[in-house]
Amino acid sequence: MAQWNQLQQLDTRYLEQLHQLYSDSFPMELRQFLAPWIESQDWAYAASKESHATLVFHNLLGEIDQQYSRFLQESNVLYQHNLRRIKQFLQSRYLEKPMEIARIVARCLWEESRLLQTAATAAQQGGQANHPTAAVVTEKQQMLEQHLQDVRKRVQDLEQKMKVVENLQDDFDFNYKTLKSQGDMQDLNGNNQSVTRQKMQQLEQMLTALDQMRRSIVSELAGLLSAMEYVQKTLTDEELADWKRRQQIACIGGPPNICLDRLENWITSLAESQLQTRQQIKKLEELQQKVSYKGDPIVQHRPMLEERIVELFRNLMKSAFVVERQPCMPMHPDRPLVIKTGVQFTTKVRLLVKFPELNYQLKIKVCIDKDSGDVAALRGSRKFNILGTNTKVMNMEESNNGSLSAEFKHLTLREQRCGNGGRANCDASLIVTEELHLITFETEVYHQGLKIDLETHSLPVVVISNICQMPNAWASILWYNMLTNNPKNVNFFTKPPIGTWDQVAEVLSWQFSSTTKRGLSIEQLTTLAEKLLGPGVNYSGCQITWAKFCKENMAGKGFSFWVWLDNIIDLVKKYILALWNEGYIMGFISKERERAILSTKPPGTFLLRFSESSKEGGVTFTWVEKDISGKTQIQSVEPYTKQQLNNMSFAEIIMGYKIMDATNILVSPLVYLYPDIPKEEAFGKYCRPESQEHPEADPGSAAPYLKTKFICVTPTTCSNTIDLPMSPRTLDSLMQFGNNGEGAEPSAGGQFESLTFDMELTSECATSPM
């Protein structure tokens, strides 16, 4: 089946990801109209070879023409219009640069296949994988619905049969007693023996029917329990396990998890059927007590049936007790499962058996590391106490969907102090951000004479005592939930498993897509793979150790890959979110690739990327310019860090950025955002209009204030080939170039440091080349 057809059958959450792949640069209609042809071309090759790209591009235009004529024959006016518009757009945008469209299509196809792979893996592994596909799930769920309906029907049928048995048994009982009393009378007066014989035969027939019915009911009950067991296994081992896996994935930024309501309906329906069946089995006992005989099937089988139904119900209740919302600090909603001591966190448990009679009946108690008391001490882990309201009664009123749940909003952790500063043992094998702890929830259910102990626990949490531990703690949460669906392996980091690049790539992309509107492209991921794994062609399947991901410093750097990336994520979220969402920040791009794509561009073309040498996270721009001899130069400005972006928005820095040439003229080297978006078009809307900067004038002064504008300036010589960044100088020493190379990023061309000026503007200085 064609890739495009397969994609159409995926679940909504995948389709949403698919929609994100397509934009105006490669419209989805085109992908749809020419699906088979598009899939038959070698776009990756075209993306790397101009001559082939030109050929494929012209063929693409030809295919559009053919499709257009088909629509013409079908009189499909709308599609004709769309195709004509698409063709005009493609010609205007890519005729001169066919490699670019090839690159875009190649990326889309690659992302599509990755999407299908994710979905397929999920389907095969049934819950071990990230998120099952819709086609598979729907079919599976329809089957489940069918089985549940079948169970309900069988329970109702049995109800009817029990009534029939009861009626017959009452008749038998009455006739038997009547005959017995008549028999006693006949003993006295020796009356009609043939009538008695007839009545005896009738009783025998009744008893035969009764026995047959009882056998039938016992056998049907056994079959029903097997059917229930099957449905229960499907619900708990597949559906609930899938939901739990999806919850893990959602916790680390993956697609949001589905709602529990449907699962709750299924589990409640099954639990109701089980209780009804349990009543029927009790009824058998009553029937047996009224009438019993040699070989009575009830005597033989009822105890085993009773045992089985109780066990099924008990297990269903235990499985139905889940952590609906994993522990999370409200101030860090996108980083659940990391808890800082002394800071409030929230969590929510839910019982997926929605019995109104249980409302306000279940008192939940929370504790931490319940089963690992001694083990923790041996391992040298820290020990904690839970403070705050650590008991709560489950109710149906607090949640807006009427689910039976308990939300804990005011919990905090406090470390138990030991003699040696909190660690129970000096030679602790794990660092604190690799220590995993479990929060346990317990309650007791008393229902229809049964006492059931319920217990569930959170996914492993990492407890930190300082917010600076957050990056490493979050890395632990990512690694754990990426690589295991074991819900309670607190010893995970004693021998952390190895991840593959495909797994890591997906999770890294989620770190962006979960808090911004855009994940990482194939090219961005390839750059990251290169940083982690060194130069290579195909990173798929390459192994990445926990140490490489987050503990060891990167080659030639004083910090790890994760620390660097996490700071970039923070930078994006706090300072350049809008620009990232627009797709204006290329971000992760190797120096070679940067040079390759910029060198063919006109002077003034620039791109935005993240600093590779700044531990704290920095963003820079690189542009093309010609030197006096007409030679193309690639220049980069020294990266802007959070500190600088605190004072001035990145968009305003870009809009106002100047270089001062040898004649002290300020010129803007940034004209087009790669590939060819005019700077004003891209960033203008993110800069405050000058009229709004100082809306008020001092009423006491005769003239209004002079307006000021901050701009960033890089001083340079005519040759524009400074190899080292300059230290900031005062305006007086602007032309004295410093030689402070600290923190410099080696760059293909010059690397510039910018100075920020506060320039006063009056109507007289309009000649200044701003």
């Epitope: 049928d157 009817q160 049969k161 027939q205 035969t208 029917a209 047959q212 019915m213 039938s216 049907e220």
Partner: nanobody, 127 residues
Framework: HVQLVESGGGSVQAGGSLRLSCAAS????????IGWFRQVPGKEREGVSV????????YYADSVKGRFTISQDNTKNTLYLQMNSLKPEDTAMYYC????????????????????WGQGTQVTVSS
């Protein structure tokens, strides 16, 4: 609740034929047994023929074997009894009955296994 209405009875000469029908409403065609019984005044009700709701099992009393045929139309929820080569001893009130239980050999004609009964239709065969 199941309601059963028989029809098709009447008077016929020996050797003649009749087709009885039994229309069932509210009938749950689950694992069940449907049958024809007959009763002559002053005698026990006896089984004539039974069929399982799926039609896999058909059983006849020795006295009617080879002459009577039981069938059903599940789309119409109707049971039939085709009676050929009728004899005077076939004269009786014919009842249609259903059981919520499966058809079991030892209780095929045990009337206590059947929990829903029709009002009956009279068949008279004269010599």
């Amino acid at each position: 609740h199941v309601q059963l209405v028989e029809s098709g009875g009447g008077s016929v000469q020996a050797g003649g034929s009749l087709r009885l029908s039994c229309a069932a409403s509210g009938f749950n065609s689950g694992d069940s047994c449907i049958g024809w019984f007959r009763q002559v005044p002053g005698k026990e009700r006896e089984g004539v023929s039974v069929i399982s709701s799926g039609g896999e099992i058909r059983y006849y009393a020795d006295s009617v074997k080879g002459r009577f045929t039981i069938s059903q139309d599940n789309t119409k929820n109707t049971l039939y009894l085709q009676m050929n080569s009728l004899k005077p001893e076939d004269t009786a009130m014919y009842y249609c009955a259903t059981s919520v239980f499966l058809c079991y050999p030892r209780t095929w004609f045990n009337r206590y296994m059947y929990n829903s009964w029709g009002q009956g239709t009279q068949v008279t065969v004269s010599s």
